[in-house]
């Protein structure tokens, strides 16, 4: 046969040769020839390549910059990049997690529907009728209004989404 024009999986075509790609964690030093194999070298410390490749340089591991609120969630290997996450109370601004912002607090009248994580912000919801929140918080849910009846009291002041009801004693009819 003549030299190939297409190659198998995990191979690449160069100078009419099908050469083996370098495995993850290794970079290309020299292409194969008619007489020699592809030559690959392991990536150095703090470097990686995560696919079968013909790259002549490995990629640098991501740096989790503490000045941006980042910390290492998973240390990189020669085959994987470092995964960053945010310090407690902060979350990533993007999927790539290149910087962090402080978790949002839910204003009075709103409660926490879902507490923030390292990668997602706080989700707030308006307090429905019968519930209130009188604080700005990243953790507090809407609280139910106090039930005056169960305390043998009556409502003296109606509740809102920001305030609880005010209970008072029942008026006693004089004999």
């Amino acid at each position: 046969p003549e030299p190939p024009t297409a190659c198998r999986e995990k191979q690449y075509l160069i100078n009419s040769q099908c050469c083996s790609l370098c495995q993850p964690g290794q970079k290309l030093v020299s292409d194969c020839t008619e007489f020699t194999e592809t030559e690959c070298l392991p990536c150095g410390e703090s470097e990686f390549l995560d696919t079968w490749n013909r790259e002549t340089h490995c990629h640098q591991h991501k740096y989790c910059d503490p000045n941006l609120g980042l910390r290492v969630q998973q240390k990189g290997t020669s085959e994987t990049d470092t995964i960053c996450t945010c310090e407690e109370g902060w979350h990533c601004t993007s999927e790539a997690c290149e910087s962090c912002v402080l978790h949002r607090s839910c204003s009075p009248g709103f409660g926490v529907k879902q507490i923030a994580t390292g990668v997602s912000d706080t989700i707030c919801e308006p307090c429905p009728v019968g519930f209130f929140s009188n604080v700005s918080s990243a953790f507090e849910k809407c609280h139910p209004w106090t039930s005056c009846e169960t305390k043998d009291l009556v409502v003296q002041q109606a509740g809102t989404n920001k305030t609880d009801v005010v209970c008072g004693p029942q008026d006693r009819l004089r004999a």
Epitope: S20, S30, D31, T33, E34, F35, T36, E37
Partner: antibody
Framework: EVQLVESGGGLVQPGGSLRLSCAAS?????????WNWVRQAPGKGLEWMGY???????NYNPSLKNRITISRDTSKNTFYLQMNSLRAEDTAVYYC?????WGQGTLVTVSS | DAVMTQSPLSLPVTLGEPASISCRSS???????????LNWFQQKPGQSPRLLIY???NRFSGVPDRFSGSGSGTDFTLKISRVEAEDVGVYYC?????????FGQGTKLEIK
């Protein structure tokens, strides 16, 4: 087109040494490939002697290992064969080769 | 070392007829990647060797398609589908999977 040109052959005294040159053109000897020396005694077959790689490292035929050195001068795009303690059996045509391209050969005669 | 044994050592052929040369290795020439570095060379009288086939079955550029190579592991064959007068010479197999590289003894093809 790759071209290889040997020089340095001739008559050598037994016990003497030789230094053959191989000037490469059309391709850098530092780019890739292994740059070989192969010899052929009169009326005999081919014998691989050794190579110098594109990165400067070597491999030699164990039968000759203690007597030969392959080196290079990258500025001249040339590689060399140094051979010591020559004997009559070393009389041969010496070829430099990338294996897909060969020099024309240079005759070395070991005789007193 | 991988010892390469060619047969026959002499091959008289009629013009236009096919010819076949065998090359056997004392050890497998397939490497860990599944590649086999077995090559065939032609050497005409008074000339340098010329690469015909590399990696068992790949024809080198400019080689007529009447030349073909096959085989695997330890057994390899060079075939000439229809011999022409210009094919006269000595044919060598060479393995470069293992160091030292080793040639077969050569097969002399002549016209009957």
């Amino acid at each position: 087109e790759v071209q290889l040109v040997e020089s340095g052959g001739g008559l050598v005294q037994p016990g003497g040494s030789l230094r053959l040159s191989c000037a490469a053109s059309g391709y850098s000897i530092t780019s890739n490939y292994y740059w070989n020396w192969v010899r052929q005694a009169p009326g005999k077959g081919l014998e691989w002697m050794g190579y110098i790689r594109y990165d400067g490292s070597n491999n030699y035929n164990p039968s000759l290992k203690n007597r030969i050195t392959i080196s290079r001068d990258t500025s001249k795009n040339t590689f060399y064969l140094q051979m010591n303690s020559l004997r009559a059996e070393d009389t041969a045509v010496y070829y430099c080769a990338r294996l897909d391209y060969w020099g024309q050969g240079t005759l070395v005669t070991v005789s007193s | 070392d991988a010892v390469m044994t060619q047969s026959p050592l002499s091959l008289p052929v009629t013009l236009g007829e096919p010819a076949s040369i065998s090359c056997r290795s004392s050890q497998s020439l397939e490497n860990t990647n599944g590649n086999t570095f077995l090559n065939w060379f032609q050497q005409k009288p008074g000339q340098s060797p010329r690469l015909l086939i590399y990696r068992v079955s790949n024809r080198f550029s400019g080689v007529p398609d009447r030349f073909s190579g096959s085989g695997s592991g330890t057994d390899f064959t060079l075939k000439i589908s229809r011999v022409e007068a210009e094919d006269v010479g000595v044919y060598y197999c060479l393995q470069v999977t293992h160091v030292p590289f080793t040639f077969g003894q050569g097969t002399k093809l002549e016209i009957k």
